[in-house]
Interface confidence: low
């Protein structure tokens, strides 16, 4: 085993090296000293380090460690941040397209419904967007509100166009009749099921991505303990005290130190693995009614079918509603 | 806008074309993300090794520093001696993670539970019977991915899955779309490509 080289007799080399870290030379001894006050770089003989230098080394070591950690996670952080932004944007666009398709369906097939239908469709899809972004909205309520709002217009414009415009009184009755008589058949229920399933999955997918960013940010900005700082200092900088400027830490030693410093962070590993695998499982299931793109872009068609269903049963419905909402109508005609 | 993989988005022609092949769908985009994330599955357990390999460590040198002295790289002392006189490593591990790490672990546990709850069991498909009067939605059942709607008079036909999506219209080629006269704000039809990562890396 070769003996360690003698310390730099004048500490000149150590001084010029330390000056890069800390401009101002007063902390570096002129010549090697006993170093009995040192707490980390415990000397075997004379040393070119002082207590103040040790403190600076500890601070630098912890900063180095933080930067290494940030650089380790940069690619992963970029990946998740960018995808979160991309998917959020993409989902907004799907919603916008779905709204446009639905409006186009009304314009092409039921022009007489358009002004009001556009308004109700707009409100519905605004709620869809808000829900995806985490708003506390109930999907069933959204769908019910859409059909509740649409039915009075369908009734007064398509099924019973003779009614006067001031049908405010009858509107409430029609909204109630819509549910009681299941005027749209099972279409609202179908839409509820499809929309709620697909939006729930979409929402949690975005939540998961945002949490991914939070996890990386948390570990990215960890402040390492004093104990860790001492270990790192001993590994990276204590050799300088002996004038060994160019020597590097042993590989096995580095691994032991890093495992000590990162014991807490490594505890995330189990849950991080589970996070990626669970996210994969979710993504694998995002198809058909669990795929908001598929569901929302097909919504115009289902709504169209639901209106056709009403029209198909118009005769029976008009009679029933005529009786059911008679009082409202009488009041209205008076 | 920047940071957007331009290749993710295709132009508005998709709505006019019956057969659009090969373009990227949202679901393929999701799968691609998962594949990339899976390459980071050991991220946290590999961190100590990663940091050692990215900080100065003796690789080709005969001698290395073990925290106390210069030793031969392959000697027993290379890993062991430097740990003498240090505080107990075991103690450091026993302290447990910092509060912020514990908090984030709790959040991960919670989202993992949610993700598992939400994951779709294989083969589960929505019931087909839509109402008690035996209504049938044309030829389109839930099992038919290609069909997203009937076509009443003047109904537009849409290829299932916008394959995807001009409208993040940050497609650089938006100017090249024949007959693309849709009004758009500058934000909508220009992309700052500086941070464009193609397939996000």
């Amino acid at each position: 085993q070769p003996p360690p080289p003698p310390p730099d007799a004048t500490c000149h080399q150590v001084r010029s090296f330390f000056q890069r870290l800390q401009p101002g030379l007063k902390w570096v001894p002129e010549t090697p000293v006993p170093g009995s006050d040192l707490q980390v770089c415990l000397p075997k003989g004379p040393t070119c380090c002082s207590r103040k230098m040790e403190e600076k080394y500890q601070l630098t070591a912890r900063l180095n460690m933080e930067q290494l950690l940030q650089s380790a996670s940069m690619e992963l952080k970029f990946l998740i941040i960018q995808n979160a932004a991309v998917f959020q944007e993409a989902f907004e666009i799907v919603v916008r397209h779905a709204k446009n398709y639905t409006n186009a369906m009304f314009k092409n097939n039921y022009p007489s419904l358009t002004p009001q239908a556009f308004e109700f469709v707009g409100e519905f899809f605004t709620d869809v967007s808000l829900y995806i972004l985490g708003s506390d909205i109930n999907v069933d309520d959204m769908v019910n509100e859409l059909f509740d709002s649409l039915f009075p217009v369908i009734y007064t414009q398509l099924m019973n166009p003779g009614l006067p415009d001031s049908a405010l009184d009858i509107n409430e009755c029609l909204r109630g009749a819509r549910r009681d008589l299941k005027v749209f058949g099972n279409f609202p229920k179908l839409i509820m099921t499809q929309v709620s399933k697909s939006l729930q999955v979409t929402r949690i997918f975005l939540q998961a991505l945002n949490l991914g960013i939070e996890v990386i940010n948390t570990t990215d900005h960890l402040k390492f303990s004093k104990d860790c700082g001492r270990m790192l200092t001993r590994m990276w900088y204590c050799s300088y005290c002996q004038g060994l400027m160019m020597v590097k830490p042993c590989g096995g030693y580095c691994n032991v130190v890093m495992q000590g410093c990162m014991a807490g962070v490594v505890e995330i590993d189990k849950y991080w693995r589970e996070y990626i695998l669970s996210l994969e499982e979710l993504v694998n299931g995002m198809y058909r009614i669990y795929d908001m793109e598929n569901v929302l872009l097909g919504l115009f068609s289902t709504i169209h079918d639901s209106i056709q269903y009403v029209q198909k049963n118009a005769g029976k419905l008009t009679t029933t509603i005529g009786k059911l909402c008679a009082h409202s109508q009488q009041r209205q005609y008076r | 806008s920047a940071y957007y993989p331009e290749d993710l988005f295709i132009d508005k022609k998709v709505l006019k074309v019956a057969h659009v092949e090969h373009e990227e769908t949202l679901s393929s985009r999701r799968r691609e993300l998962i594949q990339k994330l899976k390459s980071f599955i050991s991220f946290y357990s590999a961190l100590p090794g990663y940091i050692c390999s990215h900080s100065p460590v003796a690789e080709n040198d005969t001698l290395c520093w073990n925290g106390q002295e210069l030793v031969e790289r392959y000697s027993q002392k290379a890993a062991r001696n430097g740990m003498k006189n240090q505080f107990n490593l075991h103690e450091l591990k026993m302290k447990g993670p910092e509060p912020v790490v514990s908090q984030i672990i709790d959040k991960l546990k919670h989202i993992n539970q949610l993700l598992r709850t939400m994951s779709v069991p294989k083969g589960r498909v929505l019931d087909k019977n839509l109402d008690e009067e035996g209504f049938e939605s044309g030829d389109c059942g839930d099992d038919e991915d290609e069909c997203i709607g009937g076509s009443g008079d003047g109904m537009m036909k849409v290829k299932n899955q916008l394959r995807f999506l001009a409208e993040l219209a940050y497609d650089l080629d938006v100017d090249d779309v024949p007959g693309n006269n849709q009004q758009a704000t500058p934000k909508d039809n220009e992309i700052s490509t500086f941070h464009n990562l193609g397939n996000v890396h």
Epitope: E92 | S1, L172, P186, K187, S192, H195, L197, H201
Partner: antibody, heavy 107, light 108 residues
Amino acid sequence: QVQLVQSGAEVKKPGASVKVSCKASGYTFTSYGISWVRQAPGQRLEWMGWINAGNGNTKYSQKFQGRVTITRDTSASTAYMELSSLRSEDTAVYYCATVVYWGQGTL
Amino acid sequence: EIVLTQSPLSLPVTPGEPASISCRSSQSLLHSNGYNYLDWYLQKPGQSPQILIYLGSHRASGVPDRFSGSASGTDFTLKISRVEAEDVGVYYCMQALQTPLTFGGGTK
């Protein structure tokens, strides 16, 4: 480690053309877009244009439209910027850049 | 095109002191996804620019945490909590919302 290495300095006469190369390494070349940015003495940085290294799509600044051509050779992981009809005011340092990384510049 | 106005033109600072650089945009750089598409770069003497902050407030890898970015409407600020000698150079802001990409005039 990601690196963008540019070709060396050039001296050209007015009216001539110049072609600067930018060799990428340390990442998948086709995964990044590459921008070209120039900096004339004492002037602010000026974006000239961009190429999608994956599919070759380009976008140019209006100011340079018609004079600048950006191309890439995926097999060589290299992007090129050609500027024609040179004028004295084109004297500048020309940089290629990806997300975070910049070339060393070409005068 | 979007115009970015940086101030001050020059900022003499003593090491250890804080510093703040402002960048005002002629229009909002806030995307509908909630991110501000503004980046900060530092160009040290004789070097290429290097990224400090992206998407308004995200610190790039290896950038010391004394650097931070913030936004208020169309006003963006780069702050250095404690300036060090190595921070000397010209700082540029750059908008990445739409082409042409544009840069601020720089703060020395």
